[in-house]
């Protein structure tokens, strides 16, 4: 259905990282423009990125103001210099996205160690606590602040003389490890949302390494 | 030395909303602690009904989770429990708690190491 | 949901002896997340062990926890008159958070 010279779109996709979220989709338009529409299950229709040429819309105001809600959101396509053009049903063309809940879907970004200090034969990692574009009360809140205990981060490390890997967890973001006097040793982080089906881990942090600005040591 | 103290009416009718507060004193509601809500049915054991962040992050247990909501105020220091549509299976003994981080294999673990003294609520007509 | 299944339901002992309390899980519970609770009538439940065999601060020696994966075990090694209350295991790894039915020790 619709009029020849416009096209549905197809291929929705959610980007989402740290819940800034993305819609993307496809063709890249010829002779047509397209707006886009998102509600909740249970909310109504919101118009954003009105009769864009771009294949992608950024709805990541609207998802933040609830990332536990399921999303929906559909893609109109409006023939360029006629918006007010429709279908032979009387209808633009459109497509829906598949649903998307932030909260369960949302990709983990790359996490970043703060810092590293070592006392004796101990070292405590401080892994960033990111900020997302999630607000309460006018304040973007953390990834932490946002996950609570859903959020879990697994450190690796190891000495830098040798390729043998240890692991520790930790409900908070801070690890304290033990480790051999005299060694230096490299770390790298990676958050994990274990009770998730989809998503759950983000990829590694960089390695940081002992020795390095980073790193502050007291005996 | 954080104490904490549940507050809120001892009976509450059938079908109605239970309505519970816990104060926090001797410490910072905002200071990386979550905060629960447990239950003790009369002669039995201990059951988690859910938690919060000072953020407004919770977690609930989902047999009761579509009749709990726990909220805090950071102002006031507190964080609440409503139970709604509650039911004789509902008496108990309400305690409120603090979860705070332990260091344990290398990392940090939330465990209740603060409890409130717990008030007892009974549903009846 | 993690089961937790506590045994003995009761315990009948003489102060100086030593108590064992057993802690079973459904499935395997991350010992970074096993704790061991005393209640006694009246009041609120106190944390005594947490990550199934760290000692909480002021939580005297004789008490001691250990094992791990699904079976989890408290360890009175002399009892004292206080000693004698009922006993919780928890775990808060998985929601919903789930306690033993509890374990009674009793002055025999």
């Known amino acids: 259905s619709g009029t020849t010279n416009t096209v549905a779109a197809y291929n929705l996709t959610w980007k989402s990282t740290n819940f800034k979220t993305i819609l993307e989709w496809e063709p890249k338009p010829v002779n047509q423009v397209y707006t886009v529409q998102i509600s909740t299950k249970s909310g109504d229709w919101k118009s954003k990125c009105f009769y864009t040429t771009d294949t992608e819309c950024d709805l990541t105001d609207e998802i933040v103001k609830d990332v536990k809600q399921t999303y929906l959101a559909r893609v109109f396509s409006y023939p360029a210099g006629n918006v007010e053009s429709t279908g032979s049903a009387g209808e633009p063309l459109y497509e829906n996205s598949p649903e998307f809940t932030p909260y369960l879907e949302t990709n983990l970004g790359q996490p970043t160690i703060q810092s590293f200090e070592q006392v004796g034969t101990k070292v405590n990692v401080t892994v960033e606590d990111e900020r997302t574009l999630v607000r309460k009360n006018g304040t973007f809140l953390s990834l932490r602040d946002v996950f609570g205990k859903d959020l879990i981060y697994t450190l690796y490390y190891w000495k830098s003389s040798s390729s043998g890997k240890k692991t520790a967890k930790t409900n908070t973001n801070e690890f304290l490890i033990d480790v051999d006097k005299g060694e230096n040793y490299c770390f790298s982080v990676q958050a994990v949302i274990p009770s998730r089906t989809v998503n759950r881990k983000s990829t590694d942090s960089p390695v940081e390494c002992m020795g390095q600005e980073k790193g502050e040591f007291r005996e | 030395q954080v104490q904490l103290q549940e507050s809120g009416p001892g009976l509450v009718k059938p079908s109605q909303t239970l309505s519970l507060t816990c104060t926090v004193s001797g410490g910072s509601i905002s200071s990386g602690q979550y905060w629960s809500w447990i239950r003790q049915h009369p002669g039995k054991g201990l059951e988690w009904i859910g938690e919060i962040y000072y953020s407004g992050s919770t977690r609930y247990n989902p047999s009761l989770k579509s009749r709990v909501t726990i909220s805090v105020d950071t102002s006031k220091n507190q964080f609440s429990l409503k139970l709604s549509s509650v039911t004789a299976a509902d008496t108990a003994v309400y305690y409120c708690?603090?979860?705070?981080?332990?260091?344990?294999?290398?990392?940090?673990?939330?465990?209740?190491?603060?409890w409130g003294k717990g008030t007892t609520v009974t549903v009846s007509s | 949901e993690i089961v937790l299944t506590q045994s003995p339901g009761t315990l009948s002992l003489s102060p100086g002896e030593r108590a064992t309390l057993s802690c079973r899980a459904s499935e395997s519970v991350d010992s970074s997340y096993l704790a061991w609770y005393q209640q006694k009538p009246g009041q609120a439940p106190r944390l005594l062990i947490y990550?199934?065999?760290t000692r909480q601060t002021g939580i005297p020696d004789r008490f001691s926890g250990s094992g791990s994966g699904t079976d989890f075990t408290l360890t009175i090694s002399r009892l004292e008159p206080e000693d004698f209350a009922v006993y919780y295991c928890q775990q808060a790894g998985v929601v919903p958070y789930t306690f033993g039915g509890g374990t009674k020790v009793e002055i025999k």
């Open positions: 990550g199934a065999s």
């Open positions: 708690a603090r979860d705070a981080p332990y260091y344990y294999g290398g990392g940090y673990y939330y465990y209740m190491d603060v």
